[in-house]
């Protein structure tokens, strides 16, 4: 999906008012310095592409993030503020439904959510120069 035509300010507002705290709660008990940010993004569409990938695509050692509360809210926000997103995701979801995973918090998942927090922070500050 091409995130170029999303309403970025509405997505930012959704993140600040309904998503950010759930990421913090997920990471509770973890030091903010524990993980290095290795995933970056250069602009808002790129950030949303990376956020979608990290949130919804199972990875080795962390298969279950898509069933977390913050993931559900991200899915809902993208569907509302990105034209055509819901249509493009329907087919993808049918395939995903067949392999729903039980929610398990692993160190790899914590690292992945830490990366997500960084991506969201970058999304919210689009005018900053890339480090």
């Amino acid at each position: 999906y091409d995130f170029t035509n999303c309403d970025f300010e509405k997505i930012k507002a959704a993140y600040l008012s309904t998503i950010s705290k759930d990421l913090i709660t997920y990471m509770s008990g973890t030091k903010s310095t524990e993980f290095n940010n290795t995933v970056s993004c250069s602009n808002r569409p790129h950030c949303l592409t990376e956020i979608q990938s990290l949130t919804f695509n199972p990875t080795a050692g962390c298969a279950s993030l898509a069933k977390e509360m913050f993931a559900m809210k991200t899915k809902a926000a993208l569907a509302i503020w990105c034209p055509g997103y819901s249509e493009t995701q329907i087919n993808a979801t049918q395939a995903m439904k067949k392999r729903r995973k039980r929610k398990v918090t692993t160190n790899k998942c914590l690292e992945q959510v830490s990366q997500l927090q960084g991506l969201w922070r970058r999304f919210n500050r689009p005018l900053l120069k890339q480090q």
């Epitope: 959704a14 600040l16 008012s17 309904t18 998503i19 705290k21 759930d22 913090i24 709660t25 509770s28 069933k67 977390e68 509360m69 559900m72 809210k73 899915k75 809902a76 926000a77 569907a79 509302i80 997103y85 819901s86 249509e87 995701q89 329907i90 979801t93 049918q94 439904k97 929610k103």
Partner: antibody
Framework: QVQLVESGGGLVQPGGSLRLSCAAS????????MSWVRQAPGKGLEWVSG???????YYAGSVKGRFTISRDNSKNTLYLQMNSLRAEDTAVYYC???????????WGQGTLVTVSS | DIELTQPPSVSVAPGQTARISCGGD??????VYWYQQKPGQAPVLVIY???KRPSGIPERFSGSNSGNTATLTISGTQAEDEADYYC???????????FGGGTKLTVLG
């Protein structure tokens, strides 16, 4: 303007079935997570069920296995199929638009379901 | 699912400040929402994301959330504020939304 209009409520005997409908207008229905919330007479609000744009569903424990939520995005309509109804299912049923999955920003006017012999 | 506990009733004199509490385990780690419901009407969202007001909701409505308690505050309460108020949050395991039992706000006089 944004509107949700429920229909299909009425009197039904215990063990019976009923299908509620909710017609949505004024917004892009196919993009939103939609839900049903009920309120027994003189009691509080109870979330019943919700459904994503892609058909992914969630249910309260009290109705799981008896109620089925569905939607027809081409008709901008939300449904709730209620089977094996019990007296404790008697309530006003509200159709609701759930903003960002975790709260309700738009409510219908409600439709009364009475389960009694 | 988590349980949200509200006082059944709160009374306040016109012009005074009304505070309605909502208790729940580690509630401060989740977002809380507040709804106003008047007799025979559907609920109306008055606070979202702990402390934000939807457009059209008067400034006298405010919210806070920390620790195990969220609070809805109505400053300079008016007669029209008499209603039932429900807090709402969500369960991080089931992903279901959860309502408090509701609080009947009575404006005296």
């Amino acid at each position: 303007q944004v509107q949700l209009v429920e229909s299909g409520g009425g009197l039904v005997q215990p063990g019976g079935s009923l299908r509620l409908s909710c017609a949505a207008s004024g917004f892009t229905f196919s993009s939103y997570y939609m839900s049903w919330v009920r309120q027994a007479p003189g009691k509080g609000l109870e979330w019943v069920s919700g459904i994503f744009f892609d058909g992914e569903t969630y249910y309260a424990g009290s109705v799981k296995g008896r109620f089925t939520i569905s939607r027809d995005n081409s008709k901008n309509t939300l449904y709730l199929q209620m089977n094996s109804l019990r007296a404790e299912d008697t309530a006003v049923y509200y159709c609701a638009r759930q903003q960002y999955f975790d709260h309700i920003d738009i409510w219908g006017q409600g439709t009364l379901v009475t389960v009694s012999s | 699912d988590i349980e949200l506990t509200q006082p059944p009733s709160v009374s306040v004199a016109p012009g005074q400040t009304a505070r309605i509490s909502c208790g729940g385990d580690s509630l401060g780690g989740k977002y809380v929402y507040w709804y106003q419901q008047k007799p025979g009407q559907a609920p109306v969202l008055v606070i979202y994301g702990d402390s934000k007001r939807p457009s059209g909701i008067p400034e006298r409505f405010s919210g806070s959330n920390s620790g195990n308690t969220a609070t809805l505050t109505i400053s300079g309460t008016q007669a029209e504020d008499e209603a039932d108020y429900y807090c709402q949050s969500y369960d991080l395991q089931s992903l279901n939304i959860v309502f408090g039992g509701g609080t009947k706000l009575t404006v005296l006089g």
